[in-house]
Amino acid sequence: QEEDLPRPSISAEPGTVIPLGSHVTFVCRGPVGVQTFRLERESRSTYNDTEDVSQASPSESEARFRIDSVSEGNAGPYRCIYYKPPKWSEQSDYLELLVKETSGGPDSPDTEPGSSAGPTQRPSDNSHNEHAPASQGLKAEHLYHHHHHH
């Protein structure tokens, strides 16, 4: 493969299994020089952009997308892309967000830590969830459906 731009990676903090009403932050990472990170909900037509990009390391930049209070409608696959002028990157692999009812039981952890999808791993083997259009990014009102977006 010829690869002009490295694929971004996506991870979720504190994990990909989030109790209803709790917060989750998606972290998108790419090379230095990224101008815009985009978090897409399943397809390219539903996304949230940010230019609030920070340097994670000498060779890597990142952006964070927080959902303050997750609902069942937030469940589903998410992926990242970035714009490093003058090009958009390929998408990251998908990361599947699972939202669970809070059980309160001490034997069931609230999250799966360290969940990520990036250029060095196979697509995650999570079953596909049927889901309604969901919110992502900072708050529900920050969700945008776009037909032509770049």
């Epitope: 493969q1 399943e42 037509s45 090009k87 250029p119 196979r122 083997d125 999570n126 596909h128």
Partner: antibody, heavy 121, light 111 residues
């Protein structure tokens, strides 16, 4: 309306080279689509050749196609497939396809009508 | 190398019946699986994407499902217009393995 059109199909002799073109209209390559080539021999199934990401430039090939087939983006509306050392087994209809604008997981939603390549002496 | 093994190669069923087509991936491909319908002399048409999601304008008689690395296309209440060849495809293009491979196709004949 969004569309793809293949061109360049021809009757050529074994050992020859040929370049096919796929011209896009109604959408922008800068949006970052997977532009793919798929072929179908007469009476046979679909066979994936490879894809290029129209913005980043990343290219992916089927293992059997590496070396003899080259996919390139030659303009903001055109992708090409260069084929060399052609044999009778390469006789097929060659399709250009693009992944979806509105669906996730990269399915080929938009297809051209195909162009016929015949290899015969 | 990723291989998609599609079965059966052909099937014949009466109008109103049900056809089940299976596609086995040689490795984990998550939900990067699409199903297409192709009629003679025509370009393929997308039916199912993401293993189980129905493309716009496609009849709900077509249903996709997944169990591990086995994917299934089920066509219920068969109509004459369903006579065609159906293909699965892995739609993952990435750095760990190269997707893109199609299954061998299933020709559906309506009695």
């Amino acid at each position: 309306e969004q569309s793809l059109e293949e061109s360049g199909g021809d009757l050529v002799k074994p050992g020859a080279s040929l370049t096919l073109a796929c011209t896009a209209s109604g959408f922008s390559f800068s949006d970052g689509y997977y532009m793919c080539w798929v072929r179908q021999a007469p009476g046979k199934g679909l066979e994936w050749i490879g894809c290029i990401h129209s913005s980043s430039g990343s290219i992916y090939y089927a293992s059997w196609a590496k070396g003899r087939f080259t996919i390139s983006k030659t303009s903001s509306t055109m992708v090409t497939l260069q084929m060399s050392s052609l044999t009778a087994a390469d006789t097929a209809t060659y399709f250009c396809a693009r992944d979806s604008e509105s669906y996730g997981y990269n399915p080929c939603e938009l297809w051209g009508p195909g162009t016929l390549v015949t290899i015969s002496s | 190398e990723l291989v998609m093994t599609q079965t059966p190669a052909s099937v014949s069923e009466a109008v109103g019946g049900t056809v089940t087509i299976k596609c086995q991936a040689s490795q984990t491909i998550s939900n990067y699986l699409a199903w297409y319908q192709q009629k003679p002399g025509q370009r393929p048409k997308l039916l199912i994407y993401a293993a189980s999601s129905l493309a716009s304008g496609v009849s709900s008689r077509f249903r996709g499902s997944r169990s591990g690395t086995e994917y299934t296309l089920t066509i219920t209440d068969l109509e004459c217009d369903d006579a065609a060849t159906y293909y699965c495809q892995c739609t993952y293009y990435g750095t760990t393995y190269i997707g893109g491979a199609f299954g061998g196709g299933t020709e559906v004949e309506i009695k």
